[in-house]
Interface confidence: low
C-alpha cells in the first residue's frame, strides 16, 4: 500500500488529499500533518471560547472566482455549492475591487469548512500539532522526523507550507533541492499582517450598513468584517464577531512585537473607525507571518531534479 | 566506479588518539548516508556511527570518544583515548551496501 | 539498546542441502522491514545478500531468499553449493532517536560438508 504524507492541512493540503483519493484507485494510506492545533491554514475559523456557535474567520474572508477559475474549477464550485459548504456573498463589502465577471462566495460555516470538507472526504488520518524538522531519504522511502515522537516513513511527501518554512527543514532535503532551485523558492516572497477576531455578547448590536470594509486611510487596519453578517448567519442566540485585518506595512513594523501590544494598538486604531464599539467577551489575535504571496515565483529551468534519486538507508 | 577506501590504520599504543579516513569516489556524499562499522579479530561486526546530510548518529556504546565528519569527498572517523579493546578492522560502507576493504587498527603496549 | 539475536551461531550443511538462519530483534526495524542480510568470507569486507527483508541484492543468485517482518527475520539457502562457506550477518536499521540507528547480529557460521 502506498503510504503517502500531506504537510500542511490548508486550503492546498487538504485539496490534494481529497483528489489523491479520488485519482487513486489501489488501496492508499494518506496522512496529513499540521503544526496548528487544527485544520484551516490560512483558512482558519477561531471560535468563541464561550459560544463555539460564534466564530470569526481569521484568514480568507471570501472566496473570489474569475471567469477563468469559473470555467476551469467548476466542478469544485459546484460541489461546495451543493453541499452548502459555500454561499454567494450577497452582504455588502464595501471598497471591494470587482472585475467584470468575478463572482465571491462566502462559506456560512466558517472558511475553514472548506478544508474539512476536503479532508473529511480524503479519508486521510489528519494529525495536529505535527511539526516537521527533518526529510531523509532511507531505503528508497522519505523519513520524515517532527519535533516530538519518532520519524516516520512514506513513499511520497507533498509540502504545502509556506516556501520559508521548507527551507527551514534540515536532513537531506537540504541537498536534493538544487542551488537553482533554492534560488528560485528563495525568490517567492510573502507579506505579514495580523488578525484580530473580537467576539461580543448574544444581543450586542453593531450598527454599520455594510457587512465588511476595506479602509484606505488608516496606517494600520485594512479591513473591517462583521463577520456573522458577511456570512448570513445573524441570530438573536449567538453574538456577533469583527475581524479586523492590519495593513501589510503595520504587520511588518509590528511582526516581532508581542501580541498583546498589538492587540492595544489595534483596538485603538479601531475606536477611529467604529466608535463606541462595546467590550468584546473575547479577543483572538492571530499573527500572519506568511499571509499572502505579492511574488509567486515558479520552478523552471533548472537541470534534472534530484528529487527522485534512490539511496538506501542504512543497511 | 563507485567505491570507498579506508586508510589510516596501524599501530598504537593505548591513549592514543587516531583518525581513519574514507576515501570515496564515483558518487557525491552528499547523495549518500555512511556508516562506520568495526570487527575485533574473529570476531562479529559492530556499529560505531553514521553520517547524513541531517547530522550524525553513534552508538550509545561510544560514549563520546568517536567523532564522524565529512568533506566533499572524505568521511573521517576521530578516535580518542583508545585502549586495547579498540583493536579491530574499521569499515566504512554506504547506505546502500557498498564496503570499502577495511584498515585495521591495532592498539597495543 | 537495540539487539539482533541470530540462531544458530553455527551450521553445518551438505552440497545441495538447505540451510536456515534465524534473527530476532528486541524491538521491530524501522517500517517492519529494514533488515539487510550480509555474507562474509576472512579477509573480505561484508558482501550485502538481502535488503528490505526480503528484497535480492544485485547479482545475488537466488538460491538466497529472506523472509520476515517486524522482529523475526529468517534467512533461507536452497541448493547450497561450496562457495556458500562463510560467516553471516543480519542487520537492523532501527529509529536513531530511540536508540542505535543500526545493530549487527551475532553471526552464524555456515560450513558446507
Known amino acids: 500500500m502506498a503510504q503517502v504524507l500531506i504537510v500542511g492541512a490548508g486550503m492546498t493540503g487538504s485539496l490534494c488529499a481529497a483528489l489523491l483519493r479520488r485519482q487513486t484507485s489501489g488501496p492508499l494510506y494518506l496522512a496529513v500533518w499540521d503544526k496548528a492545533e487544527d485544520s484551516g491554514g490560512r483558512m482558519t475559523t477561531a471560535c468563541s471560547p464561550h459560544n463555539p456557535q460564534c466564530t470569526a474567520d481569521l484568514g480568507a474572508q471570501y472566496i473570489t472566482c474569475t471567469p477563468h477559475y469559473a470555467k476551469k474549477h467548476q466542478r469544485f464550485y459546484d460541489e461546495l455549492l451543493a453541499y452548502g459548504v459555500l454561499r454567494p456573498l450577497s452582504s455588502p463589502i464595501e471598497g471591494m475591487v470587482m472585475k467584470e465577471g468575478d463572482c465571491n462566495f462566502v462559506a456560512p460555516q466558517g472558511i475553514s469548512s472548506i478544508i474539512k470538507h476536503y479532508l473529511k472526504e480524503s479519508g486521510a488520518e489528519v494529525y495536529f500539532r505535527h511539526r516537521v524538522t527533518q526529510i531523509n531519504l532511507r531505503d528508497d522511502k522519505w523519513e520524515v522526523s517532527k519535533q516530538t515522537g519518532s520519524p516516520e516513513q512514506f513513499d511520497l511527501i507533498v509540502l504545502t507550507m509556506p516556501v520559508p518554512e521548507i527551507l527551514q527543514l534540515q536532513g537531506d532535503i537540504t541537498t536534493l533541492i538544487s542551488e537553482c532551485q533554492r534560488q528560485q523558492l528563495e525568490a517567492v516572497s510573502y507579506s505579514s499582517r495580523y488578525a484580530l477576531g473580537l467576539f461580543y455578547e448574544a444581543g450586542t448590536k453593531i450598527d454599520v450598513p455594510w457587512a465588511g470594509q476595506y479602509i484606505t486611510s488608516n496606517p494600520c487596519i485594512r479591513f473591517v468584517s462583521i463577520d456573522n453578517k458577511k456570512r448570513n448567519i445573524e441570530s438573536s442566540e449567538i453574538g456577533p464577531s469583527l475581524v479586523i485585518h492590519t495593513t501589510v506595512p503595520f504587520g511588518v513594523t509590528y511582526l516581532e512585537h508581542s501580541i498583546e501590544d498589538v492587540q492595544e494598538l489595534v483596538f485603538q486604531q479601531l475606536e477611529n473607525i467604529l466608535p463606541g464599539l462595546p467590550q468584546p467577551i473575547a479577543t483572538k489575535c492571530q499573527k500572519w507571518r506568511h499571509s499572502q504571496v505579492p511574488s509567486a515565483g515558479v520552478i523552471l529551468g533548472c537541470a534534472k531534479s534530484p528529487w527522485m534519486m534512490a539511496i538506501g538507508f542504512p543497511i | 566506479c563507485q567505491s570507498l577506501e579506508e586508510s589510516g590504520g596501524r599501530l598504537v599504543t593505548p591513549g592514543t588518539p587516531l583518525t581513519l579516513t574514507c576515501t570515496v569516489s564515483?558518487?557525491?556524499?552528499?547523495?549518500?548516508?555512511i556508516y562506520w562499522v568495526r570487527q575485533a579479530p574473529g570476531k562479529g561486526l559492530e556499529y560505531i556511527g553514521i553520517i547524513f546530510n541531517g547530522g550524525t548518529y553513534y552508538a550509545r556504546w561510544t560514549k563520546g570518544r568517536f567523532t564522524i565528519s565529512k568533506t566533499s569527498t572524505t568521511v573521517d572517523l576521530k578516535m580518542t583515548s583508545l585502549t586495547t579493546e579498540d583493536t579491530a578492522t574499521y569499515f566504512c560502507a554506504r547506505g546502500d551496501g557498498i564496503w570499502g576493504p577495511g584498515t585495521l587498527v591495532t592498539v597495543s603496549l | 539498546a537495540q539487539v539482533l539475536t541470530q540462531t544458530p551461531a553455527s551450521v553445518s550443511a551438505a552440497v545441495g542441502g538447505t540451510v536456515t538462519i534465524n534473527c530476532q530483534a528486541s524491538?521491530?526495524?524501522?517500517?517492519?522491514?529494514?533488515l539487510a542480510w550480509y555474507q562474509q568470507k576472512p579477509g573480505q569486507p561484508p558482501k550485502r545478500l538481502i535488503y528490505s527483508a526480503s528484497t535480492l541484492a544485485s547479482g545475488v543468485s537466488s538460491r538466497f531468499k529472506g523472509s520476515g517482518s517486524g522482529t523475526e527475520f529468517t534467512l533461507t539457502m536452497s541448493g547450497v553449493e561450496c562457495d556458500d562457506a562463510a560467516t553471516y550477518y543480519c542487520a537492523g536499521s532501527f529509529d536513531c532517536n530511540s536508540g542505535d540507528c543500526v545493530a549487527f547480529g551475532g553471526g552464524t557460521e555456515v560450513v558446507v560438508k
Open positions: 564515483g558518487f557525491s556524499l552528499n547523495n549518500y548516508h
Open positions: 524491538q521491530s526495524v524501522f517500517n517492519n522491514n529494514y
